[in-house]
Amino acid sequence: ADRAALEELVRLQGAHVRGLKEQKASAEQIEEEVTKLLKLKAQLGQDEGKQKFVLKTPKGTRDYSPRQMAVREKVFDVIIRCFKRHGAEVIDTPVFELKETLTGKYGEDSKLIYDLKDQGGELLSLRYDLTVPFARYLAMNKLTNIKRYHIAKVYRRDNPAMTRGRYREFYQCDFDIAGQFDPMIPDAECLKIMCEILSSLQIGNFLVKVNDRRILDGMFAVCGVPDSKFRTICSSVDKLDKVSWEEVKNEMVGEKGLAPEVADRIGDYVQQHGGVSLVEQLLQDPKLSQNKQAVEGLGDLKLLFEYLILFGIDDKISFDLSLARGLDYYTGVIYEAVLLQMPTQAGEEPLGVGSIAAGGRYDGLVGMFDPKGRKVPCVGLSIGVERIFSIVEQRLEASEEKVRTTETQVLVASAQKKLLEERLKLVSELWDAGIKAELLYKKNPKLLNQLQYWEEAGIPLVAIIGEQELRDGVIKLRSVASREEVDVRREDLVEEIRRRTNQPLSTC
């Protein structure tokens, strides 16, 4: 009876989930009901006495195939070369931190932190980003000056839409400048780096939205938002890139208890965006110009735009008052890069299709870890590589471009049987000379099979050993690109392979 009831519940719950999808219920509600369905199915499995274990990766995670890894490494290479070009050092930190280290740093996002089950010792959490661990590292080592990059996985208990390149385990590529410097110079460099990387990756047209936490706070103050509601109203404003002003206003008034007239005043500001002229216009604003914080923020943005013009990237930057990045630790300039979808109608503005990089100034974060509250000014950026991987992968799929998943330069093959020893000797010579080489793991492989593997793997060269060639002291070298085949003296083979693959002299 129990089993029949469970089966009926699984059927009913399945129908319930389908109904919710048809009604276009909220993603969270659907997710919750799907989770319930899976729990019911799991109980059915246990009831059978042998639970059907479904082989899959945990929710919000994925494996990377060799093809995907090849894409990923190319993306990382572009990013790392840029970071190094700007003089950054590299660090690494543990994947988990003391829970206390992460507590109180992320505002409303704190609920997304993964806590590890207490093993009777320290209370631990998986890192949520690379910025808070960096601040902890600075405070712990009493560092006041560093320019560093850090590429590593972070963890968020989000309800991700994996199709849009969002995950629970994902890479972040961070670049940060810590230290007391003249205003806006490091900030401008961060924006320059962001633009360099996004341009190099050739993933499409992008725009970097810029704002300042002080302008936001000043704006909220002059609009009449109570201090206690600043952060929560911030998170509502930040949704303006995804939903209409009406929906944001309804959330502010209906859910967050803001007076409608206060919300309207906010609306007058946050729907504005432009360049340095908007900064100047707001400096003349009768209300904002009376707010010390807002004036400081606007003054810094004016200076920032001067540097951005010198860096030649001002055309990529937009001052956007609706940008209100949701992390509690930002104190000054904040920025976010979005990919632009070109307008379908002439005269329309380009449409933002999701954040691909972001960052800002966080002058107070290190002080949170310092016993004396000593501050280390910091500014940084984070590249949203998972989104970028998705875009690059989609583009490659659409173009049907072949992606090489190995760096093998030459396949060592044999034309006749009983030449395994010769192949092993030759491949070893090549490895010792720093050449990337492979052979098939068969004693007597058919030449056709070897050549087929060579072509499919996209290996540029094949070195073919034959009995006659052995007697003559030569190796046949065939190129996949030109299809030409030449006899190369054995002692010249390494040099010839290097020449053909443009590889500098190197040994392992």
Epitope: E8, H16, E32, T35, K36, Q43, R157
Partner: antibody, heavy 120, light 107 residues
Framework: QVQLVESGGGLVKPGGSLRLSCAAS????????MSWIRQAPGKGLEWVSY????????NYTDSVRGRFTISRDNAKNSLYLQMNSLRAEDTAVYYC?????????????WGQGTLVTVSS | DIQMTQSPSSVSASVGDRVTITCRAS??????LAWFQQKPGKAPKLLIY???NLESGVPSRFSGSGSGTDFTLTISSLQPEDFATYYC?????????FGQGTKLEIK
């Protein structure tokens, strides 16, 4: 056998706060959605709030949203209801209840209830 | 919110009688309906879930039927211990709501 024992009820003035607790035993607490259901004296039943097995999902009836907070500690096999800004209409017996088949919103096991009286 | 309406609000019957209580939902709830029995000073006790499934340990004289918006609880032959208040509850969508109750009294 399944046992749910509520505590923390009592007399409180309007605007005051109380924290109800529910100690669970006899089943794998961390597998089950849990809920608080109340019953005003001489009245019907009202489903106040629920929380999922790992606290990912919570929900509240409109009359308590923003004032009450449901939470759980799976390590301690305990369910909690933090009640703030209490009103006279919150006076009721509060029952802690376990979901049927872990996730079905039907209470198959109930505690004995704890009385909350809000009065000046 | 889904409203649940029970009828009658009270019923008098004798031991051995067949009793039917009905419950109507303000909108379709498929089979997401449960029935509870409550005695004075006690917590409710689950009798029926998903409209017709008998909770283990509940006597077979209790049965449930219906789907969509109309549901019934039937006690085929009343026993002395069955005199109590009966509630229906929808488990289709939050807030999960109960009927106002049907008091079953001895005639």
């Amino acid at each position: 056998q399944v046992q749910l024992v509520e505590s923390g009820g009592g007399l409180v003035k309007p605007g005051g706060s109380l924290r109800l607790s529910c100690a669970a035993s006899g089943f794998t607490f961390s597998d089950y959605y849990m809920s608080w259901i109340r019953q005003a004296p001489g009245k019907g039943l009202e489903w106040v709030s629920y929380i999922s097995d790992s606290s990912t999902y919570t929900n509240y009836t409109d009359s308590v949203r923003g004032r009450f907070t449901i939470s759980r500690d799976n390590a301690k096999n305990s369910l909690y209801l933090q009640m703030n800004s209490l009103r006279a209409e919150d006076t009721a017996v509060y029952y802690c209840a376990r979901y049927l088949y872990q996730v079905i919103a039907v209470a198959d096991s109930w505690g004995q209830g704890t009385l909350v009286t809000v009065s000046s | 919110d889904i409203q649940m309406t029970q009828s009658p609000s009270s019923v008098s019957a004798s031991v051995g009688d067949r009793v039917t209580i009905t419950c109507r939902a303000s909108q379709g709830i498929s089979s997401w309906l449960a029935w509870f029995q409550q005695k004075p000073g006690k917590a409710p006790k689950l009798l029926i879930y998903v409209a017709s499934n008998l909770e283990s340990g509940v006597p077979s004289r209790f049965s449930g039927s219906g789907s969509g918006t109309d549901f019934t609880l039937t006690i085929s032959s009343l026993q002395p211990e069955d005199f109590a208040t009966y509630y229906c509850q929808q488990a289709n969508s939050f807030p999960y709501t109960f009927g106002q109750g049907t008091k079953l009294e001895i005639k």
